[in-house]
C-alpha cells in the first residue's frame, strides 16, 4: 500500500491516576504505513530516555496500516515539577516531524 | 507476581486529541497480572476505529495496555463512550466512562 502519515494525538494523565501517585502521558500514532516510526518525548524541551514504552498493533486487515502507542511514565512528583510535555513523531509520510504537546494543568 | 486486577484510567478527548472532524479517546489499563485483559467499547456496540494495543510488561512485573478509539468530534458532547475492561484472572470488571475534561 502507499505511504500513510500517522494522525498524532497526546493525552495527559487523568486526575484519577495522579491521585494514585503516578502519571502516564500517552502519545498515539494512528493508521500509518510503513511501520517504521520514531517517537521522542520532551519534557520542558529536555529529551527523555528510558522512561517510556511503546506498543504497536498488528497490521490492519482492512487498510494495512499500523497504530502505535507510546507511554511516558513518571511519578506524580516528577510530573508536577515540569510544565510542557511533548511527543515528537518522525515518519516517512511526514515532510517534517510532528510535535503534539500540552501544558500541565491547562486544558 | 501474584494476581492483580488493573486500574483503569480515562484518556480523555481534548483539543490535543482532535484532528479535523476526528477525536481520539481511550482507556489506560494499568498494573495487572497476569495476562490477558479484554477491552470493548460501549459493550461491543462500538468497533470501528478501535485499537487495543498489545500489553507491555513494566519493570514492576505488571502489565499495562491502552485501548483507543476514534469517533466524530461532533459526537463528544452528545453521547457516552465507555470502555469495558475484563480481567478474568482477578475477576475484575471495570466500565469506565470517558468524557471530555471539564475545564
Amino acid at each position: 500500500r502507499t505511504v500513510a502519515a500517522p494522525s498524532v494525538f497526546i493525552f495527559p494523565p487523568s486526575d484519577e491516576q495522579l491521585k494514585s501517585g503516578t502519571a502516564s502521558v500517552v502519545c498515539l500514532l494512528n493508521n500509518f504505513y510503513p511501520r517504521e516510526a520514531k517517537v521522542q518525548w520532551k519534557v520542558d524541551n529536555a529529551l527523555q530516555s528510558g522512561n517510556s514504552q511503546e506498543s504497536v498493533t498488528e497490521q490492519d486487515s482492512k487498510d494495512s496500516t499500523y497504530s502505535l502507542s507510546s507511554t511516558l511514565t513518571l511519578s506524580k512528583a516528577d510530573y508536577e515539577k515540569h510544565k510542557v510535555y511533548a511527543c515528537e513523531v518522525t515518519h516517512q509520510g511526514l515532510s517534517s516531524p510532528v510535535t503534539k504537546s500540552f501544558n500541565r494543568g491547562e486544558c | 507476581a501474584s494476581t492483580k486486577g488493573p486500574s483503569v484510567f480515562p484518556l480523555a478527548p481534548s483539543s490535543k486529541s482532535t484532528s479535523g472532524g476526528t477525536a481520539a479517546l481511550g482507556c489506560l489499563v494499568k498494573d495487572y497480572f497476569p495476562e490477558p485483559v479484554t477491552v470493548s467499547w460501549n459493550s461491543g456496540a462500538l468497533t470501528s476505529g478501535v485499537h487495543t494495543f498489545p500489553a507491555v510488561l513494566q519493570s514492576s512485573g505488571l502489565y499495562s495496555l491502552s485501548s483507543v478509539v476514534t469517533v466524530p468530534s461532533s459526537s463528544l458532547g452528545t453521547q457516552t463512550y465507555i470502555c469495558n475492561v475484563n480481567h478474568k484472572p482477578s475477576n475484575t470488571k471495570v466500565d469506565k466512562k470517558v468524557e471530555p475534561k471539564s475545564c
Epitope: - | 472532524g21 466524530p72 459526537s75 452528545t78 453521547q79
Partner: antibody, heavy 110, light 110 residues
C-alpha cells in the same frame, strides 16, 4: 471550505454508477462522511456513513444496494445495479452536517 | 436503525408568528440531533446541532430543545425568509443507530 459531488448522469436500470465527493479547503481524510439522497419533490434520505478507517455503515434499506469507500482525497458512492427508484439528487456531507455539496443528479430510466 | 418521526408535515403561520416542529426518535439518542433548513434547489443548511446548540450565524429566533426521544424546533418572529422545509436528523454515532432524517416539515407564510 466546500464539497462537490460528481458522476451524476442518466443511466439505464442495472448500469453500475459511481459518484465521487471531493473537498476544497480541508482534508477529507480526517472527517467522517455521509451520503444522503433526495428524490424529486421528496425528503432527505440517509444512505450511509464512512468512518476515518474506511468502515462503512448503511441505512437498512441501502445495504447491498450501495457501497461507500474512500481514498485519501475522495469519498465514493457506488450503486451496483440502480433502479428507477434510485432517481434522485445525491449529496455528500461532513458527518457534522456543517458542510454539504450542491448535489449531483442521477436519473435512472429506460 | 433509529426511526425519526417528524410532525407536522406542513404548517402555515403569519409573519411574526411562531412555528413549532416536533421530532420523535424510536429510541433514546441523548442529544444527538440536528435540525436543517432546506430551500428549493439548495442543499440543506445546518441550523442546530446537539439538539439545542445554534450554528454560527443562525438567528436566535431558531431554538432547539429536547433530549432522549422527544425534540422540538421553535421558530419565533416568523419571517418570509424562513419559508423552507425543515428536517431533523439523528446524529448518534454507532452502527446500530444510523443517521436517519425525519420526513420534513414545510413551513409557509399564511
Amino acid at each position: 471550505q466546500s464539497l462537490e459531488e460528481s458522476g451524476g448522469r442518466l443511466v439505464t436500470p442495472g448500469t453500475p454508477l459511481t459518484l465521487t465527493c471531493t473537498a476544497s479547503g480541508f482534508s477529507l481524510s480526517t472527517y467522517y462522511m455521509n451520503w444522503v439522497r433526495q428524490a424529486p419533490g421528496k425528503g432527505l434520505e440517509w444512505i450511509g456513513t464512512i468512518t476515518i478507517d474506511g468502515t462503512a455503515y448503511y441505512a437498512s434499506w441501502a445495504k447491498g444496494r450501495f457501497t461507500i469507500s474512500r481514498t485519501s482525497t475522495t469519498v465514493d458512492l457506488k450503486a451496483a445495479s440502480p433502479t428507477t427508484e434510485d432517481t434522485a439528487t445525491y449529496f455528500c456531507a461532513r458527518y457534522d452536517g456543517d458542510i454539504w455539496g450542491p448535489g449531483t443528479l442521477v436519473t435512472v430510466s429506460s | 436503525d433509529v426511526v425519526m418521526t417528524q410532525t407536522p408535515a406542513s404548517v402555515s403561520e403569519p409573519v411574526g408568528g411562531t412555528v413549532t416542529i416536533k421530532c420523535q426518535a424510536s429510541q433514546s439518542i441523548s442529544t444527538a440531533l440536528a435540525w436543517y433548513q432546506q430551500k428549493p434547489g439548495q442543499p440543506p443548511k445546518l441550523l442546530i446541532h446537539g439538539a439545542s446548540i445554534l450554528e454560527s450565524g443562525v438567528p436566535s429566533r431558531f431554538k432547539g430543545s429536547g433530549s432522549g426521544t422527544e425534540f422540538t424546533l421553535t421558530i419565533s418572529d416568523l419571517e418570509c425568509a424562513d419559508v423552507a422545509t425543515y428536517y431533523c436528523q439523528c446524529t448518534y454515532y454507532g452502527i446500530s443507530y444510523g443517521n436517519a432524517f425525519g420526513g420534513g416539515t414545510k413551513v409557509e407564510i399564511k
